[in-house]
């Protein structure tokens, strides 16, 4: 078929996505690469039941995803407008806090441990959502 | 089985051109990252280009960023490195490999095929 | 660029012992490394990923440990088809990269 009916084999469905979960941490820079040879990109949450999606999934653990601001503005990585999009940060956040000692801000976003966003520091080896749409994601049947 | 078989080497002069190929079989090719790997005479190996499944995102180390490109046809289950504006540093044999899904380990590997860049 | 550093660069035995190679990392890499055999005129051969895991077909003599910085390829009881030089590589980061190698020679 010209389209994919599924996702890969351990991607998660959901309303025409697909899903990966990291186990282990990267920095923000990785896991876009990461997400980026697999086909995908980090997540982009654009709806109040995307966002309790991937919540159920990651659990109380600090997790990012595909939301920076290291050239200025905030930025989606694949370009969903983040002015008029969804938004769920953390109270008083983003606040680009200096006050961590690591040398400049706080430039990349995270899921945080009651789901709610905060911005930290892009280095820190925090785990990460992939996501692909389903009809992008490989022309091939799911892999066995 | 899974196979990869490498082609395209030569002897070029500095400054030249030349496009290697993989040709792989054996496993759904659309569906696997891929790379290029080189080891120079006498040498290390060192990692130069991956390609995502799909095409569309590529990766390069410094040394070749801007002379080498990484393609692939899915339709022709085959991996390119076309390499431009060769040096003599770029003397060494090629390897193209798959990549393990998720963990990014290369668990298969072509035989390799010999570039020379010499005058 | 994370730099990998192996130790020793080459190590001498005899078939039957047991032989320990060392990777280090010049940065946390997590679990991210894989080990690799190589034959003089051969393409390498993956023997661990994701540091510790056993690549299909690889005799369980070999197996690999650590994590974060510092790694362990160990040859439990070496077999003369091991006698070839082994390679670390970290793929956490671009650009992915490998140790020097360590030759492991008949004594």
């Known amino acids: 078929g010209s389209e994919r009916t599924c996702c890969p084999v351990n991607w998660v469905e959901h309303e025409r996505s697909c899903y990966w979960f990291s186990r282990s941490g990267k920095a923000w820079a990785d896991a876009d690469n990461y997400c980026r040879l697999e086909d995908a990109h980090l997540v982009v949450v654009t709806s109040w039941e995307e966002q309790k999606f991937v919540q159920h999934h990651i659990g109380p653990v600090n997790t990012w995803m595909g939301l920076h601001d290291q050239n200025g503005p905030w930025k989606w990585v694949d370009g969903t407008d983040y002015e008029t999009g969804f938004k769920n940060w953390r109270p008083e956040q983003p606040d680009d806090w200096y006050g961590h000692g690591l040398g400049g801000g706080e430039d990349c976003a995270h899921f945080t441990d009651d789901g709610r966003w905060n911005d930290d520091v892009c280095q820190r080896p925090y785990r990460w959502v992939c996501e692909t749409e389903l009809d992008k994601a490989s022309q091939e049947p799911p892999l066995l | 089985e899974v196979q990869l078989l490498d082609s395209g080497g030569g002897l070029v002069q500095p400054g030249g051109s030349l496009r290697l190929s993989c040709a792989a079989s054996?496993?759904?090719?659309?569906?696997?990252?891929m790379s290029w790997v080189r080891q120079a005479p006498g040498k290390g190996l060192e990692w130069v280009s991956a390609i995502s499944g799909r095409g569309g995102n590529t990766f390069y180390a410094e040394s070749v960023r801007g002379r080498f490109t990484i393609s692939r046809d899915n339709s022709k289950n085959t991996l390119y490195l076309q390499m431009n504006s060769l040096r003599a540093e770029d003397t060494a044999v090629y390897y193209c490999?798959?990549?393990?899904?998720?963990?990014?380990?290369?668990?298969?590997w072509g035989q390799g095929t010999l570039v020379t860049v010499s005058s | 660029d994370i730099q990998m550093t192996q130790s020793p660069s080459s190590v001498s035995a005899s078939v039957g012992d047991r032989v320990t190679i060392t990777c280090r990392a010049s940065q946390g890499i997590s679990n991210w490394l894989a080990w690799y055999q190589q034959k003089p005129g051969k393409a390498p051969k993956l023997l661990i990923f994701a540091a510790s895991n056993l690549q299909s077909g690889v005799p369980s003599r070999f197996s690999g440990s650590g994590s974060g910085t510092d790694f362990t390829l160990t040859i439990s009881s070496l077999q003369p088809a091991d006698f070839a030089t082994y390679c670390c590589?970290?793929?956490?980061?671009?650009?992915?990269?490998f140790g020097q190698g360590t030759k492991v020679e008949i004594k």
């Open positions: 490999a798959k990549i393990i899904r998720e963990q990014w380990a290369f668990d298969y």
């Open positions: 054996g496993f759904t090719f659309s569906s696997y990252a």
């Open positions: 590589q970290q793929v956490n980061s671009f650009p992915w990269t």
